[in-house]
């Protein structure tokens, strides 16, 4: 015998109190699959959360974070404070990036400026708290009389990583 509840579509529940009739989900509840015996309570996006998508009879509400915060985790389970560019979030709140580091986003940590010399290049534009340095051509390319044509790259010996 087929379970009569299996005929109940999403947005309804199988009401045992009414001879297993498919009843619509009550307000502020939903069922996202058929054959449900109960409807789930809709998530409420309050406080630090705000509603990104309203709850419907077939799908839960979706939250994001109020301005000044950003979502963490699947389904925006928590919110983390935003900082300004050029800052990072510490245990004592937002702090400016230390000299030699930058953060170009409202979240995340300050990262060290690129070391241009490791790539044999010079610094074209200095770094700031908000921006990484911009590396330019190698110092040799900038010397007077240097050819503007880039010479072919020398063949690398096996086992050596590129410069």
């Amino acid at each position: 015998l087929q379970d009569p509840c299996s005929n109940c579509p999403a947005g309804t529940f199988c009401d045992n109190n009414r001879n297993q009739i498919c009843s619509p989900c009550p307000p502020n509840s939903f069922s996202s699959a058929g054959g449900q015996r109960t409807c789930d309570i809709c998530r409420q996006c309050k406080g630090v959360f705000r509603t990104r998508k309203e709850c419907s009879s077939t799908s839960n509400a979706e939250c994001d974070c109020t301005p000044g915060f950003h979502c963490l985790g699947a389904g925006c389970s928590m919110c983390e404070q935003d900082c300004k560019q050029g800052q990072e979030l510490t245990k004592k709140g937002c702090k400016d990036c230390c000299f030699g580091t930058f953060n170009d986003q409202k979240r995340g940590i300050c990262r060290p400026w690129t070391n241009c010399s490791l790539d044999g290049k010079s610094v074209l534009v200095n770094g700031t708290k908000e921006r990484d340095v911009v590396c330019g051509p190698s110092p040799a390319d900038l010397s007077p009389g240097a050819s503007s044509v880039t010479p072919p790259a020398p063949a690398r010996e096996p086992g050596h990583s590129p410069q």
Partner: nanobody
Framework: EVQLVESGGGLVQPGGSLRLSCAAS????????MGWVRQAPGKGREFVSA????????YYADSVKGRFTISRDNSKNTLYLQMNSLRAEDTAVYYC?????????????????????WGQGTQVTVSS
């Protein structure tokens, strides 16, 4: 055994100040996001403020922003709520709550279902 014990409530005149404390025990305090929730007579719960496990992220309800300050001392396993410029509408029972999850050291939540543990509450009455 997990315990959250609030203290510091009382009767205060409008414009006055109080500092609530919540002493926690029985869990790794710094791993838990903490919150202060209040309930006035005949009204629903209102999330007043929340703070992440490491203390970097704080949230305040619009109704208390600029007047209340949440803080925590992880070395003392204690949560605080400094309440200044108190108003009659701040009269309520204040509860502290603790919840943990993957991001609770750096994030906050104002969803009551996130919080695993609740204190018994402390009464704050603002009246002249």
């Amino acid at each position: 055994e997990v315990q959250l014990v609030e203290s510091g409530g009382g009767l205060v005149q409008p414009g006055g100040s109080l500092r609530l404390s919540c002493a926690a025990s029985g869990f790794t305090f710094s791993s838990y996001a903490m919150g202060w929730v209040r309930q006035a007579p005949g009204k629903g719960r209102e999330f007043v403020s929340a703070i992440s496990g490491y203390g970097g992220t704080t949230y305040y309800a619009d109704s208390v922003k600029g007047r209340f300050t949440i803080s925590r001392d992880n070395s003392k396993n204690t949560l605080y709520l400094q309440m200044n410029s108190l108003r009659a509408e701040d009269t309520a029972v204040y509860y502290c709550a603790a919840g943990t999850g993957y991001y609770s050291r750096v994030g906050v939540s104002t969803d009551p279902s996130f919080y695993d543990y609740w204190g018994q509450g402390t009464q704050v009455t603002v009246s002249s």
